[in-house]
């Protein structure tokens, strides 16, 4: 039985550019201790879409939904979509240490934008 | 109905060794992060130790680490504290309690009390 | 170590009436919006007994009565109206991802 799953329920999300998109992201369980952290793409090369502690990320607000009793929510909404935000998105969940070691990844977000 | 049950606690010398126990039920145990949590006389809350639902990752402390181990066996329901080089602040009711989500601590035994003196 | 701090030490409240306990935490504990604050109920001789959790949440099974609010540093645990089965030692805590986890040093809460 895994000790931690991070679960990203939405395979797709299309939104319409200017508007909003939410992605969607549980973890089972805060332990391992560490972050939550969100990425576009994989590899070396990904891009940082929002940490917790670290950065600024203007466009990018949590919203999370505390009243969930199994799990913890560490969704995410990016405002003012536009074409250059399709992509798949990552929720990672990584173990406190120096440095932080990633441990597990959601399934993946492909974010689709239409035109307004 | 959830059911914790400690054991194990006494009274040792500084220096001494005791290990806790915690016998769980009515509740899919290896789902669960456990943990102890101590009281001391007249005093409040302080957490003690933490492990995953698979025991790989435990957390203390630095008030006990090095000195108290965390271990469990999902197979037998169990959660074991073993406490060694005990000093007389160590001295409270040790409680066993668990957790679902690792964040707020769900349900508690009843407590077993450790008395370090010499 | 992000210290909790609750005021006040003891209350005595009429029966009927609105208990406020509150709790301050040295630094946020707040995650991805969620205030991981949770909130406890210790009567005389027992253990601890779960109440609120992450701020505001109400524990299955706990008189709605309690209830709980406040976010990042300022916490509330409100009982209103307060029963004579209340009374008893109210202790906040915090899970963020700051270790150790900690507690308050506890409000007794009594009967005027």
């Known amino acids: 039985e895994e000790e931690l799953q991070v679960i990203q329920p939405e395979k797709s999300v299309s939104v319409a550019a200017g508007e909003s998109a939410t992605l969607n992201c549980t973890a089972t369980s805060l332990i391992p201790v560490g972050p939550i952290q969100w990425f576009r793409g994989v590899g070396p090369g990904r891009e940082l879409i929002y940490h917790q502690k670290e950065g600024h990320f203007p466009r990018v607000t949590p919203v999370s939904d505390p009243t969930k009793r199994n799990n913890m929510d560490f969704s995410i909404r990016i405002s003012n979509i536009t074409p250059a935000d399709a992509g798949t998105y990552y929720c990672v969940k990584f173990r406190k240490g120096s440095p932080d070691v990633e441990l597990k990844s959601g399934a993946g977000t492909e974010l689709s934008v239409r035109a307004k | 109905e959830v059911q914790l049950v400690e054991s194990g606690g006494g009274l040792v010398k500084p220096g001494g060794s005791l290990r806790l126990s915690c016998a769980a039920s009515g509740f899919t145990f290896s789902s669960y992060v456990m943990s102890w949590v101590r009281q001391t006389p007249g005093k409040g809350l302080e957490w003690v130790a933490t492990i995953s639902s698979g025991g790989t990752y435990t957390y203390y402390p630095s008030s006990v680490k090095g000195r108290f181990t965390l271990s469990r066996d999902n197979a037998k329901n169990s959660l074991y504290l073993q406490m060694n080089s005990l000093r007389a602040e160590d001295t409270a009711v040790y409680y066993c309690?668990?957790?679902?989500?690792?964040?707020?601590?769900?349900?508690w035994g009843q407590g077993t009390t450790v008395t370090v003196s010499s | 170590d992000i210290v909790l701090t609750q005021s006040p030490a003891s209350l005595a409240v009429s029966l009927g009436e609105r208990a406020t306990i509150s709790c301050r935490a040295s630094?946020?504990?707040?995650?991805?919006?969620?205030?991981?604050m949770h909130w406890y109920q210790q009567k005389p001789g027992q253990p601890p007994k779960l109440l609120i959790y992450r701020a505001s949440n109400l524990e299955s099974g706990v008189p709605d009565r309690f209830s709980g609010s406040g976010s990042r540093t300022d916490f509330t645990l409100t009982i209103n109206p307060l029963q004579a089965e209340d009374v008893a030692t109210y202790y906040c805590h915090q899970s963020s991802d700051e270790l150790p986890w900690t507690f308050g040093g506890g409000t007794k809460v009594e009967i005027k």
């Open positions: 309690a668990s957790s679902l989500t690792g964040s707020s601590f769900d349900y």
């Open positions: 630094e946020s504990v707040d995650l991805y919006g969620t205030s991981f």
